[in-house]
Interface confidence: medium
């Protein structure tokens, strides 16, 4: 089942999602929270980590197809590593090819998530809203 | 806790959300699914009902604040009753004041949901994507 179902299917089973922190969004056993308070990238990261989560990591268009719907721009956990020119997630893993369309909006080493799997390069010190994510085991 | 948290709070508890149909979004124990196939309002309603759900009903800005984030336009369960001029949900309940900003985009008796709690009036026969919702008990 895609978030955007192409045909109507009567679900065979109902299931619980989670566990997630209270009042977070749960989708395909990942937890998401959107924070409306604008912070720079570093403070956004700290906010997520203080809640046992990390900034949004995009790892699958299928498992995370709800992200197609998201309007506006929000900090995610993607950062540019100047020494080797790569884009990496907070955990050190490399951005997989074809997952995000990277758009150079500004000079910077951090990236904002925008709908339809786009990443906008931005100066890490600029305040923005942000998305935290917690992967359930 | 709002979906848009204004301050960092370490969640005291982790909890499961649902139950929901498999791979639907769960938020504050409501289930949502976004369908990418364009249908007119009547077919959209039939699609949701076939999955033991209904078209989106907006009943609370607090409990449904994830809807602030939704981009694009999608059929919801709101219909115009010509005899008395009111807007009602599929279940017959009246649209609460101040929940939605109703915008007359077209002449019509159905409404599209758009981000930030806006409802766009549209001809019920026009195909659009749609949002199904299932309230958990």
């Amino acid at each position: 089942n895609s978030l955007f179902n192409q045909e109507v299917q009567i679900p065979l089973t109902e299931s619980y999602c989670g566990p997630c922190p209270k009042n977070w969004i749960c989708y395909k056993n990942n937890c998401y929270q959107f924070f409306n308070e604008s912070k720079n990238w570093y403070e956004s990261q700290a906010s997520c980590m203080s809640q046992n989560a990390s900034l949004l990591k995009v790892y699958s268009k299928e498992d995370q197809d709800l992200l197609k719907l998201v309007k506006s721009y929000h900090w995610m956990g993607l950062v540019h590593i100047p020494t080797n020119g790569s884009w990496q997630w907070e955990d050190g893993s490399i951005l997989s090819p074809n997952l995000l369309t990277i758009i150079e909006m500004q000079k910077g080493d951090c990236a904002l998530y925008a709908s339809s799997f786009k990443g906008y390069i931005e100066n890490c010190s600029i305040p923005n809203t942000y998305i935290c994510m917690q992967r359930t085991v | 806790n709002s979906l848009f948290n204004q301050e960092v709070q370490i969640p005291l508890t982790e909890s499961y959300c649902g139950p929901c149909p498999k791979n639907w979004i769960c938020y504050k124990n409501n289930c949502y699914q976004f369908f990418n196939e364009s249908k007119n309002w009547y077919e959209s309603q039939a699609s949701c009902m076939s999955q033991n759900a209904s078209l989106l009903k907006v009943y609370s800005k607090e409990d449904q604040d994830l809807l602030k984030l939704v981009k694009s336009y999608h059929w919801m369960g709101l219909v115009h009753i010509p005899t008395n001029g009111s807007w009602q949900w599929e279940d017959g309940s009246i649209l609460s004041p101040n929940l939605l900003t109703i915008i007359e985009m077209q002449k019509g008796d159905c409404a599209l949901y758009a981000s930030s709690f806006k409802g766009y009036i549209e001809n019920c026969s026009i195909p659009n994507t749609y949002i199904c919702m299932q309230r958990t008990v």
């Epitope: 570093y42 906010s47 980590m49 203080s50 990496q88 955990d91 050190g92 890490c124 | -």
Partner: antibody
Framework: QQLEQSGGGLVTPGGSLKVCCKA?????????MTWVRQAPEKGLEWIGC?????????YYANWVNGRFTLSRDIDQSTGCLQLNSLTAADTAMYYC??????????????WGQGTMVTVSS | DIQMTQSPSSLSASVGDRVTITCQAS??????LNWYQQKPGKAPKLLIY???TLQSGVPSRFSGSGSGTDFTLTISSLQPEDFATYYC?????????FGGGTKVEIK
């Protein structure tokens, strides 16, 4: 860019001690300061980390169990580790460390010189 | 918590030898793995991050490989200054954990 550690020394079981780490040459508020310890002839053990910015967010290893507390002073660009209810098992070299980039939190390229804490009666 | 298992715990080698140290994670950590070198009485030094990226200033005889759960640190031609203890550390998520270390000694 450097981290200069202070504190440490000999403490009796059940006692407390504070170890601090002063940062210089970089913007302390955009980095995480991490603490790692190493018992004599043993491996490295992560204790926790604190964000240098306004939030002062902290993260601890599960085994810490509230005995240790991280704090930071933005004006002084200093992070501290408060050690309480100490036992002989806490005897170790305590290191502060900083990530290689502000955007990282878990990869450390700058380390303090270490501070020895000995718990003995 | 993610457990990191390093092997061997110690090895003896000669200058010029090719040395391989392995590290296994208890669950998939993608390429979120770092390698450190530590000499007696000194703080650890970062050698490699993101499993295979050489830290600035580290000699090219050091290389890292692997992804998922199995990782390798290789020293292509051991030099006298390379005799030390090497640690792997995952950077996947908190809590962070290190491997038990591999002591490289002179044969």
């Amino acid at each position: 860019q450097q981290l200069e550690q202070s504190g440490g020394g000999l403490v009796t079981p059940g006692g407390s001690l504070k170890v601090c780490c002063k940062a210089s040459g970089f913007d302390f508020t955009t980095y995480w300061m991490t603490w790692v310890r190493q018992a004599p002839e043993k491996g490295l053990e992560w204790i926790g980390c604190i964000h240098g910015g306004d939030s002062g967010a902290t993260y601890y290893a599960n085994w810490v169990n509230g005995r240790f507390t991280l704090s930071r002073d933005i004006d002084q660009s200093t992070g501290c580790l408060q050690l309480n209810s100490l036992t002989a098992a806490d005897t170790a070299m305590y290191y502060c460390a900083r990530p290689g980039y502000p955007s990282w939190s878990k990869t450390f390229d700058l380390w303090g010189q270490g501070t020895m804490v000995t718990v003995s009666s | 918590d993610i457990q990191m298992t390093q092997s061997p715990s110690s090895l003896s080698a000669s200058v010029g030898d090719r040395v391989t140290i392995t590290c296994q994670a208890s669950q998939d950590i993608s390429n979120a793995l770092n390698w450190y070198q530590q000499k007696p009485g000194k703080a650890p030094k970062l050698l490699i991050y993101a499993a295979s990226t050489l830290q600035s200033g580290v000699p090219s005889r050091f290389s890292g490989s692997g992804s998922g759960t199995d990782f390798t640190l290789t020293i292509s031609s051991l030099q006298p200054e390379d005799f030390a203890t090497y640690y792997c550390q995952h950077s996947n998520s908190f809590p962070l954990t290190f491997g038990g270390g591999t002591k490289v000694e002179i044969k």
